[in-house]
């Protein structure tokens, strides 16, 4: 272990200690304004009160004091934009990892009370306020409701609703964790007229058991319908209802593609184009075709037409459509043509415009880099974030083209900004882009400031960390490079994070530290001070990240390059950079490990088990084991079918039980959660039952009730502890 | 013009089955819900079961489900009632109804079911 | 359920007086999911009143409908001699839809 320099009295700066990440003591924040119009938003103040700002008169007031917010302990709120209702949410009750159930109440702001009479239900599931006025649409017991207003009594949409089985205007668990990432599976159209809605029938899925132990005498069960790869699938239904008059017609049945219909299929998004004009996504269960497909409501048949010609087919013949997910179409003022991210004939996803057909496609931005997403198309601009700047996958530029241009001329508004400290950025947009707040995350600290939509021009900061800023400065920080290795025809991007007093003759125990799942990135120039920085901080631990292949925003030949092949190239790309980075001469090839998380523990786990030599030790939290275990539309998105006739083989080759007898030589840490709704503690279980019966000796910690974040402040601070434990005694570091 | 017609009504006994149909014209018949309300004689109306447009989603009056089923073929753009286990309290005028919850704008003349022994 | 409760049962006017029919209801519907019915022997009802008290197609102004929550009212400004005939409220807020016993406008 290297010895640490002696610094004088005057200039003591401390390492960081594993109490301060556990503590969150350098947590940092962000500024998203909740944007009302073109010039105002909300945001919720230090002491919670909900306050208005207006950018262009420069007046701020509390719309919503925080007493009103603690008379019924709420912690979120929604304003109806109408402006005379705010609805105030209280009771948060955590589900999966989007959904949650919370209690709703609606306060008049006009009135200063709280709406009286009909009042909602506990607990709901989803609501939210029509775009226009102040209609809601919750969901409760997975059926749909609908009020006029916040007093009315409310008007029941669907009635089929079911526990586990039927779910109205809410994902089940595959569509809400794989599909739409989101809690809820209903759009209001842009004038509130309509309520477009998925209804999943989880009837035919089988069901995933597991005990949640609680305090009770006996546990309890938790039931959840989980598609597991290759098992019956919900079957989804797009219904649009007018809320205008929802008892005349009830809901509205939306067609799905021919082409899509013939055989198992995902719906994959919705998005409102104009009042009366839809845009539905869909997938086929195989995830290699798409097909957009743009509605029309027809006021003479009083029905949704989706013509043939308005159904626009994206495949990839490379490996799956999308990248995590396919893109979604941002359309223009016409309301007819739209922009979308797709790959290009050389596999970069790029923005193409497309006006009638995908084959007709303008192709708006090319180059060996990716364009990552479109924030908003105004009458003459289109936002978008981008990896081009100086050829680092893992930055984040916003950028501007004119599209109103003829050619369009692209500007980058943020790669010269902060150059240092800023080289990764989200944006928040106003109504039609007249303002926007950007959010720098790294790699220096995270920076939150406003700008004129128009010019670009920085008009205020919003959040810079002043405070975090004064509390790091005594703290001796880690150094972090971003670099990449070349082995053979491939180019590998790497993290590393150096002790405060490297010193390349000496030699340092290496961690590394994988995700290495498809179409994830994991080398980003963002600012962190978590457990890997204070292993480096205080223990002196190299630690390194690297994006082998299979992850994001490199071109589609790197990307799927894992395709039907999952742990095949993950993992020899983690053992390459190894040997490169003994190479470097730093590194003590005694004490090398490796450790990740859930797909990261898969990859560790079989890296452990390479039979290399490489690993002394390693740790897997929440390994996935067999891609049999895992979601259909997960697993088989990138390795197909596990049936005979498709891609079975591979499924059994690539378990981590296949390969037990190979953890013989090193130290093995496997965790996992009891209640871990998303990688079954049946993958651990598993890897546990191998190594038995290979009569190989390893460690394992379970986390009794804990899901697949393992959260809880006392299980987090246990998990850590045990892991840094494991890896100083793997390392041979004291005490 | 809108035009609803019902047949199939008649005297059936009680446990025995019938089968309504209602065909439509006048509008674009797919596109729209539709109901069946009954009216006993002297008596008042009674919605009995409605189907949306596309004949996915069917709802039933407690008095009739698991008895009766409504469903719909588009491309005749006809309407029908299966009406199983039938009883006495069955016996009405049957109306076809255009409209969902409320708002039943179009109504047929209506055909009588008689369950008697 | 949502009951209805109609009333008069029966209401005795001569043509060109003012009749006013009541519907309530046994929890609140609101005026948008309120419709209201004439039928007339030996024929099918008749939509008369819609969403948020509008007349249907082709119904004289004379027709009107009011009322919020749970307390609503037909009211026929002038009976013409074809007006005598039963009246039926529905509401559509909740499953099962369901109709007033109806009130039978008579010539007195």
């Known amino acids: 272990r290297p010895s640490r320099v002696y610094k004088p009295e005057g200039n003591t700066k401390r390492a960081l200690t594993l109490k301060d990440i556990l503590n969150g003591t350098f947590s940092y924040k962000t500024y998203f304004p909740n944007w009302i119009s073109e010039q105002e938003y909300l945001h919720q103040s230090e002491d919670d009160n909900i306050v208005f700002y207006n950018i262009e008169t420069r007046e701020s007031y509390i719309i919503l004091s925080n007493s009103t917010m603690k008379s019924v302990n709420a912690t979120d709120y929604g304003l109806s934009p109408d402006r005379q209702f705010v609805y105030l949410e209280s009771d948060y009750s955590k589900l999966w990892r989007y959904s949650y159930t919370a209690t709703y109440y609606i306060y008049d702001l006009q009135n200063g009370e709280f709406v009286r009479g009909y009042e909602l239900p506990r607990p709901i599931q989803y609501l939210c306020w029509s775009p226009v006025g102040s209609k809601l649409a919750y969901v409760y017991q997975n059926n749909i409701y609908l009020k006029q207003r916040p007093g009315d009594p409310p008007f029941q949409i669907t009635y089929t609703g079911r526990e586990n089985r039927i779910f109205n205007g809410i994902p089940d668990w595959v569509y809400e964790e794989e599909m739409l990432a989101t809690k809820y599976a209903l759009w209001w159209s842009p004038d509130g007229k309509f309520l477009a809605y998925v209804e999943f029938n989880d009837s035919d899925i089988p069901i995933i058991a597991y005990s949640y132990y609680g305090d009770g005498q006996y546990p309890r069960t938790i039931n959840i319908p989980y598609p597991k790869a290759g098992a019956k699938n919900p079957v989804v239904r797009v219904f649009i209802v007018d809320t205008t008059y929802p008892h005349h017609v009830g809901p509205m049945e939306v067609p799905v593609p021919e082409m899509i219909a013939s055989s198992d299929y995902y719906f994959s998004w919705l998005t409102w184009v104009s009042s009366e004009r839809v845009c539905l996504q869909w997938l086929k269960r195989v995830q290699n075709v798409s097909v957009l497909s743009i509605c029309d409501f027809r006021e003479d048949w009083h029905a949704w037409e989706c013509p043939k010609n308005q159904e626009h087919v994206e495949e990839s013949r490379t490996g799956w459509a999308g990248g995590f997910f396919v893109s979604t179409p941002a359309f223009s003022q016409d309301a007819t043509s739209y922009y979308k991210i797709f790959s290009d004939k050389d596999g970069y996803k790029h923005i193409h415009y497309i006006k009638d057909t995908v084959e007709n496609a303008i192709q708006i931005t090319s180059g060996k880099w990716e364009a990552i997403y479109i924030f908003r198309v105004t009458q003459d601009s289109l936002f978008y974030s981008s990896n081009e700047f100086e050829g680092y996958p893992g930055r984040r530029n916003i950028y501007r083209i004119s599209i109103g241009n003829s050619p369009p001329s692209k500007k980058c508004v943020t790669c010269h900004l902060r150059k240092e400290r800023c080289q990764y950025y989200t944006a928040s947009f106003s109504y039609k882009a007249k303002y926007y707040a950007l959010v720098c995350y790294g790699p220096g600290l995270p920076i939150s400031t406003l700008h004129d939509g128009r010019t670009d021009q920085e008009i205020q900061v919003l959040e810079e960390n002043k405070e975090l800023e004064n509390s790091l400065r005594n703290i001796q920080l880690p150094k972090v490079e971003i670099k990449k290795l070349k082995d053979g025809g491939l180019t590998f991007w790497y993290k590393m994070i150096l002790p405060p007093q490297f010193d390349r003759s000496k030699k340092y125990p290496l961690l590394i530290q994988v995700y290495g799942g498809p179409c994830s990135q994991s080398v980003k120039s963002v600012f962190a001070v978590n457990w890997i920085t204070y292993l480096a901080s205080k223990e002196g631990i190299v630690i390194a990240l690297v994006d082998g292949r299979g992850t994001a925003f490199q071109g589609d030949k790197f990307l799927h390059a894992v395709y039907r092949k999952l742990g095949v190239y993950e993992v020899e790309d983690q053992l390459t950079a190894v040997r490169k980075f003994i190479e470097m001469g730093f590194i003590d090839e005694e004490r090398i490990a490796i450790w990740g998380w859930s797909y990261g523990g898969y990859v560790s786990s079989l890296a452990l088990a390479s039979g290399t030599g490489l690993f002394k030790c390693g740790i897997a939290v929440a390994p996935v084991s067999s891609w049999e275990y895992y979601a259909s539309i997960y697993s088989e998105r990138f390795m197909g079918l596990p049936t005979k006739d498709d891609n079975l083989e591979h499924y059994k080759n690539s378990t981590v039980m296949a390969r037990a007898e190979y953890f013989r030589n090193v130290d093995y840490l496997l965790i996992h959660g009891t209640a871990d709704d998303n990688v079954h503690f049946q993958n651990s279980a598993q890897i546990a039952k191998a190594l038995v019966n290979a009569q190989v000796d390893f460690q394992a910690m379970w986390y009794s009730d804990q899901n697949h974040g393992i959260l809880s402040g006392r299980s987090q601070n246990h998990l850590y502890t045990h892991m840094t434990h494991f890896l100083k005694q793997c390392f041979s570091l004291s005490d | 013009e809108v035009q609803l017609l019902e047949s199939g009504g008649g005297l059936v006994q009680p446990g025995g089955s019938l089968r309504l149909s209602c065909a439509a014209s006048?509008?674009?018949?797919?596109?729209?819900?539709m109901s069946w309300v009954r009216q006993a004689p002297g008596k008042g109306l009674e919605w009995v079961s409605g189907?949306?447009?596309?004949?996915?989603?069917?709802y039933y009056a407690d008095s009739v489900k698991g008895r009766f089923t409504i469903s719909r073929d588009n491309s005749k753009n006809t309407l029908y009632l299966q009406m199983n286990s039938l009883r006495a309290e069955d016996t009405a005028v049957y109306y076809c109804?255009?409209?969902?919850?409320?708002?039943?704008?179009?109504w047929g003349q209506g055909t009588l079911v008689t369950v008697s022994s | 359920e949502i009951v209805l409760t109609q009333s008069p049962g029966t209401l005795s006017l001569s043509p060109g007086e003012r009749a006013t029919l009541s519907c309530r209801a046994s929890?609140?519907?609101?005026?948008?999911?309120l419709a209201w019915y004439q039928q007339k022997p030996g024929q099918a009802p008749r939509l008369l009143i819609n969403?948020?008290?509008r007349r249907a197609t082709g119904i004289p102004d004379r027709f009107s409908g009011s009322g919020s929550g749970t307390d609503f009212t037909l009211t026929i400004s002038r009976l013409e001699p074809e007006d005598f005939a039963v009246y039926y409220c529905?509401?559509?807020?909740?499953?099962?839809?369901?109709f007033g016993q109806g009130t039978k406008v008579e010539i007195k």
């Open positions: 109804a255009k409209g969902w919850f409320g708002g039943f704008n179009y």
């Open positions: 969403v948020g008290s």
């Open positions: 006048g509008f674009t018949f797919s596109s729209y819900a």
């Open positions: 189907i949306i447009g596309s004949g996915g989603i069917t």
């Open positions: 529905q509401q559509g807020i909740m499953l099962p839809p369901t």
């Open positions: 929890q609140s519907v609101t005026s948008s999911y």
